[in-house]
Each structure stands twice: as C-alpha cells, then as structure tokens.
Interface confidence: low
C-alpha cells in the first residue's frame, strides 16, 4: 500500500509488510476459531498455482515497539499492535477435509490507547 | 479481527469492516495498477463460488473524521487514512483475459502524522 | 462424461481378501475427493471411506482397521483393500465422486459407478 | 454420531399426485448440508439435491427440497411413472462418518 513517507509523513505506528507463501505459513486460524493448515498449491485450470499472502504487522524492531509516535502521553499510554483480516485460502482441517475458508492473516498495524489514570 | 474496545481501549483511528461481494465491488486495481473487473463468482465443481472480500476503512461518520485520537495536537497534524493490501481475486482484465490476480483492498485505517511547522 | 468403473468384486470366504478397483474418466481425477458406499442385500446405503486430494483418508468405524481405501492418480483409479472379510461385508459397492479442492469441504455425492457385487460365504 | 431418520418407511401415492418426505436429523446440520439421493431397482443412487434445496445438474424442477438445522423435505410436485423410486437423505455436515437415512419407497398406489 502507499507509502506515507513518500509524502513527508510518519505513521504513528511503523509495520513491516511482506509476501508469505503457504508453506512459509503452515497453519492457519479460520473463522470459527480452528486451526487449519495452509496448502501450499491450488489447483487451476492450467496446473497449479502457489499459494501466497501479503501480510503486514508491527515492525519488531522500529521505533514505535516501545508506544505509538505522537501521542499526547500526558493523558494516554499507547501500543502498536498488530490486526487481522480475512482472506480466503485453500486449506484443510483436523479431518483433512479440504477446501476453500477465510483465513485470519496480519494486515495492519494501529495504534490503540488506554487513558492514564490518577496523574 | 480482535476489537480493541473490549479490553478498554480506544482505537487512535475509527474503522468499519464488512464483507463485499465481487458484485458490489465490481472492479479493482491489480499489482501493476491496472484496472480489472472482479468476477461475480468462481467456478465450483458443483456450480460457483460467491466471490467476495473482507474490507475494513476509516469511519467517515466517525469521531476520529477530523484527525486521529489521542495524538500531541502541539506538535503533530493527523489524519485517518485507509490502506491496503492485496488480495487474490478471479478477474478479468482490459483485454478480456480470466485470470486469478492480486487486487489491492481496503484492509485498515491507521493514523499518519506530520510535524507542526513554525509555531 | 463423468464414468466411474468399479471391478475386483466376487465371492470370497470369510476371512479373506479382495482388492477393488474405481476406473475414472471424464473429470480430472487429482481435483476430486472419492468414496466407497455399499449396499446390502435388501438394505439402506452405507458409507464406507472417503478419500481426499491429498490422500487423506477416513474409515467408518466397521470397517477401521480391516479396509484400506487408496488412489493412483497417474492411472485414474480408486481402490479398496478389503481383507478379513466377513458375512456382514456382503454388499454392492460403489465408487461415487466426492466434490473437489474448489468446494467448501462439506461435499455429497455427485457421480456414482454401477457398483461391483462382493460375496462373502461363512 | 449424527443420525437421519426419514419417513414415512414408504408411500403409496398415484402419478399426478404430490410427494412430500421427510428426512430428520439427530442434531443440527446447518442451512444446507444436506443431499437427496434417488435409487431405483439394480442402479446406483443418483444425486437429486444438494446443500438443502439445490437441483443437481439435469434434475427436472418438480423436484424441491427444503428445510434447515434438523428438519428437511424432499417434494415432487408431481409425480411421473419414472420418479417410483427409493429415495435416501445423507448429511455431509459433520463427518467422518458420512451419514444416509434409511429410506424412503414411492411406490405406486
């Protein structure tokens, strides 16, 4: 996705983004909470085609990993953290049943607060 | 994805999220930023698969409409800006050919910043 | 045209063995789960085993241990080992389709074969 | 387990008249994860409905089904001399093991 510093701007949080192939991933969480494997190819009418996802999470080692950038930190604590969203992948589950599910990947990183208390 | 509120935080963006069919999305960009017509459905072998796609964005009814929560307002302009991330999607492209792409969608809203100048 | 062939029944002691064969044609064959249901004589449809694109494999409970479902993708064909057979295993056995990757894994039936007759004498 | 229980054992009705049967489960399987199937003497089973309510490829339109969670029905509006037949539901919600009712004979009156 765009990228703010292009516009001299900063994110409040800073992530990293990155292309995860199936068999990179393993397992997976579905929509009803169960863990699911990944395939790693799905078939297409010419073959197969590998199986990919573009994740993005807090970046570990920026300089947000301590609280969000710019935050009036007299009234808020803050953290980065990591969110989800659903894609759907070809996958099977812990009776092998195999088939297409939405999957809960990383996409964001944002930041959330919690107002301090007694200052 | 895990909703910040439930835990007593607060969000520095407002988001909405909902499922978009290839129906009401109807076209896209790809990774090479071309536009591409989102197939309704994908071929099943036992008829078709709706298409469609978990979106999240800024709340434009949100409070957070005119800037991010939470943030040093001394030192920083906000804003509450969507971004992407890519999806892979039946589609069709200029030239009529069908293929399975990486389409950009809304995936988050995160806040970006820039520095108060000359105050 | 979707075909399913079914061979290797025939009459056997108890105890024994036999190896059932599923020819497939018609469809491509990688892409799709497969299954054996049988029928006894006079009696109701019985699931048997299932097994999927990626060799998965599930027995029902009468047969755990004994039945043995495979597949040979280069030659199109579905297979059951069948061994210590008994009476109780007397049935018309059917190989039928099971769905394919594209589908959510809750699956029926689509295509059946004629089914092979397995004769099982005490 | 999930187990079908389908009624009635049979059913004598006259071509021209309307079939409705009955398929039960033992616990909720979903909105659709439920198929009919119909067999007649010395030929495999042939799919006539699937997910609850959708026709099979080639399936003529009197044949319907309908229901959700435990209670499913299989309705030929109007029978012809071919829809004679035994007719078995199966639930593909919750398996292993995949599950069929025990039937259901339309026979002629």
């Known amino acids: 996705h765009s990228d703010p510093a292009r516009r001299g701007e900063l994110s409040v949080c800073d992530s990293i983004s990155e292309w995860v192939t199936a068999a990179d991933k393993k397992t997976a969480v579905d929509m009803s909470g169960g863990t699911v494997t990944v395939l790693e190819k799905v078939p297409v009418s010419k073959g197969q085609l590998k199986q990919y996802f573009y994740e993005t999470k807090c970046n570990p080692m920026g300089y947000t990993k301590e609280g969000c950038r710019g935050i009036d930190k007299r009234h808020w604590n803050s953290q980065c953290r990591t969110t989800q969203s659903y894609v759907r992948a070809l996958t099977m589950d812990s009776k092998k049943r195999i088939g297409w599910r939405f999957i809960r990947i990383d996409t964001s990183c944002v930041c959330t607060l919690t107002i301090k208390r007694g200052r | 994805h895990s909703d910040p509120a439930r835990r007593g935080e607060l969000s520095v963006c407002d988001s909405i999220s909902e499922w978009v069919t290839a129906a009401d999305k109807k076209t896209a960009v790809d990774m090479s930023g071309g536009t591409v017509t989102v197939l309704e459905k994908v071929p099943v072998s036992k008829g078709q698969l709706k298409q469609y796609f978990y979106e999240t964005k800024c709340n434009p009814m949100g409070y957070t409409k005119e800037g991010c929560r939470g943030i040093d307002k001394r030192h920083w302009n906000s804003q509450c800006r969507t971004t992407q991330s890519y999806v892979r999607a039946l589609t069709m492209d200029s030239k009529k050919r069908i293929g399975w792409r990486f389409i950009r969608i809304d995936t988050s809203c995160v806040c970006t910043l820039t520095i108060k100048r000359g105050r | 045209e979707v075909q399913l062939l079914e061979s290797g029944g025939g009459l056997v002691q108890s105890g024994g063995s036999l190896r059932l064969s599923c020819a497939a044609s018609?469809?491509?064959?990688?892409?799709?789960?497969m299954t054996w249901v049988r029928q006894a004589p006079g009696k109701g449809l019985e699931w048997v085993s299932t097994?999927?694109?990626?060799?998965?494999?599930y027995y029902a409970d009468s047969v755990m241990g004994r039945f043995t479902i495979s597949r040979d993708n280069s030659k199109n064909t579905l297979y059951l080992q069948m061994n210590g057979l008994r009476a109780e295993d007397t049935a018309v056995y059917y190989c039928?389709?099971?769905?394919?990757?594209?589908?959510?894994?809750?699956?029926?039936?689509?295509?059946w074969g004629q089914g092979t007759t397995v004769t099982v004498s005490s | 387990k999930i187990v079908l229980t389908q009624s009635p054992g049979t059913l004598s009705l006259s071509p021209g008249e309307r079939a409705t049967l009955s398929c039960r489960a033992s616990?909720?399987?979903?909105?659709?994860?439920l198929a009919w199937y119909q067999q007649k003497p010395g030929q495999a089973p042939r799919l006539l409905i699937y997910?609850?309510?959708r026709r099979a490829t080639g399936i003529p339109a009197r044949f319907s089904g309908s229901g959700s969670g435990t209670d499913f029905t299989l309705t030929i509006s109007s029978l012809e001399p071919e829809d004679f037949a035994v007719y078995y539901c199966?639930?593909?919600?919750?398996?292993?093991?995949?599950?069929f009712g025990g039937g259901t004979k339309v026979e002629i009156k």
């Open positions: 997910d609850a309510s």
């Open positions: 039928a389709t099971t769905g394919t990757t594209y589908d959510y894994p809750h699956y029926p039936m689509d295509f």
């Open positions: 616990q909720s399987i979903g909105s659709r994860y």
């Open positions: 018609g469809f491509i064959f990688d892409d799709y789960a």
């Open positions: 097994i999927n694109q990626n060799s998965g494999t």
């Open positions: 199966q639930q593909y919600y919750d398996w292993p093991p995949l599950t």
